[in-house]
């Protein structure tokens, strides 16, 4: 896991290759702080490897957009599922109350 930034920036070097959205497990952006005065982006790949990304790279900016879009879509899907569960529960409750009435 990334070190707590207390004495230096975490990203001394940045990844040279292209990172694809499919290989991403997590993407963390660190705001400037007293220990590091610049934005840092640390990607965790699905194979567990952590790597720093260059915030000024056009490819990285595009990757961040795609990642954030994916994250918000997943959140929407989760919320949708919660909604559906609530509806199902309501239906079940109303069915139960009907059953009670008929018995």
């Amino acid at each position: 896991t990334p070190v707590v930034r207390k004495g230096r920036c975490s990203c001394i070097s940045t990844n040279q290759g292209t990172i694809h959205l499919q290989s991403l497990k997590d993407l963390k952006q660190f705001a400037p702080s007293p220990s590091c005065e610049k934005i840092e982006i640390i990607a965790t790949l699905k194979n567990g490897v952590q790597t720093c990304l260059n915030p000024d790279s056009a490819d990285v900016k595009e990757l961040i957009k795609k990642w954030e879009k994916q994250v918000s879509q997943k959140k929407k899907q989760k919320n949708g599922k919660k909604h559906q569960k609530k509806k199902v529960l309501k239906v079940r409750k109303s069915q139960r109350s009907r059953q009670k009435k008929t018995t």
């Epitope: 070097s13 990844n15 040279q16 610049k38 790597t51």
Partner: antibody, heavy 121, light 109 residues
Framework: QVQLVESGGGVVQPGRSLRLSCAAS????????MHWVRQAPGKGLEWVAL????????YYADSVKGRFTISRDNSKNTLYLQMNSLRAEDTAVYYC??????????????WGQGTTVTVSS | EIVLTQSPGTLSLSPGERATLSCRAS???????LAWYQQKPGQAPRLLIY???SRATGIPDRFSGSGSGTDFTLTISRLEPEDFAVYYC??????????FGPGTKVDIK
């Protein structure tokens, strides 16, 4: 192939200055943090300085702080070490080394052959 | 400043034997930030192990690293003639300086 070549070493009098250069080739220099490490005759390795990939962050060993300045020119793929107020104890072979660029920190994976600095009156 | 101590200072062994080199830190070091290097006379150092236990590209599997916290070990399972050299550990923690240990010399018995 991936290569680092140091230059600029030589014999210099105490109190004088010297600038070392390290020419990088075979990799994307602007992605990599770069280090200077030195080795006094018959002694072990001593980390001297580090500069981040974008040149924004510099870090120094206490023994050189305020006297040495690390810098880089990404357009020329070159790393520098400006050494001022040189002392006899700065006599060493100076290596430049690449910070591993692929992972989150993995060590210094490429080293130059070294350039010798001798501080003597 | 984190101080690294390596032991023994010199290790005299024969080819085919197992070498165990120790590196102890004065305070805890994250495993992600400990590396081992090999240096032969007149040559630049070479990265062997990073992240305490991962072998660098092209390093034979007879080299292995282990440990965490303040105690780290480099093991060479069967010494080959080309393995006789000086070995350094280095820590690269959350604040500079990024110190090296004093080194362990592995020489032929």
């Amino acid at each position: 192939q991936v290569q680092l070549v140091e230059s600029g070493g030589g014999v210099v009098q105490p109190g004088r200055s010297l600038r070392l250069s390290c020419a990088a080739s075979g990799f994307t220099f602007s992605n990599c943090g770069m280090h200077w490490v030195r080795q006094a005759p018959g002694k072990g390795l001593e980390w001297v300085a580090l500069i981040g990939f974008d040149g924004i962050n510099e870090y120094y060993a206490d023994s050189v702080k305020g006297r040495f300045t690390i810098s880089r020119d990404n357009s020329k793929n070159t790393l520098y070490l400006q050494m001022n107020s040189l002392r006899a104890e700065d006599t060493a072979v100076y290596y430049c080394a690449r910070d591993w660029p692929e992972g989150y920190y993995n060590g210094m994976d490429v080293w130059g052959q070294g350039t010798t600095v001798t501080v003597s009156s | 400043e984190i101080v690294l101590t390596q032991s023994p200072g010199t290790l005299s062994l024969s080819p085919g034997e197992r070498a165990t080199l120790s590196c102890r830190a004065s305070q805890s070091v994250s495993s992600s930030y400990l590396a081992w290097y090999q240096q032969k006379p007149g040559q630049a150092p070479r990265l062997l192990i990073y992240g305490a236990s991962s072998r660098a590209t092209g390093i034979p599997d007879r080299f292995s690293g282990s440990g965490s916290g303040t105690d780290f070990t480099l093991t060479i399972s069967r010494l080959e003639p080309e393995d006789f050299a000086v070995y350094y550990c280095q820590q690269y923690g959350s604040s500079p300086p990024f110190t090296f240990g004093p080194g362990t010399k592995v020489d032929i018995k």
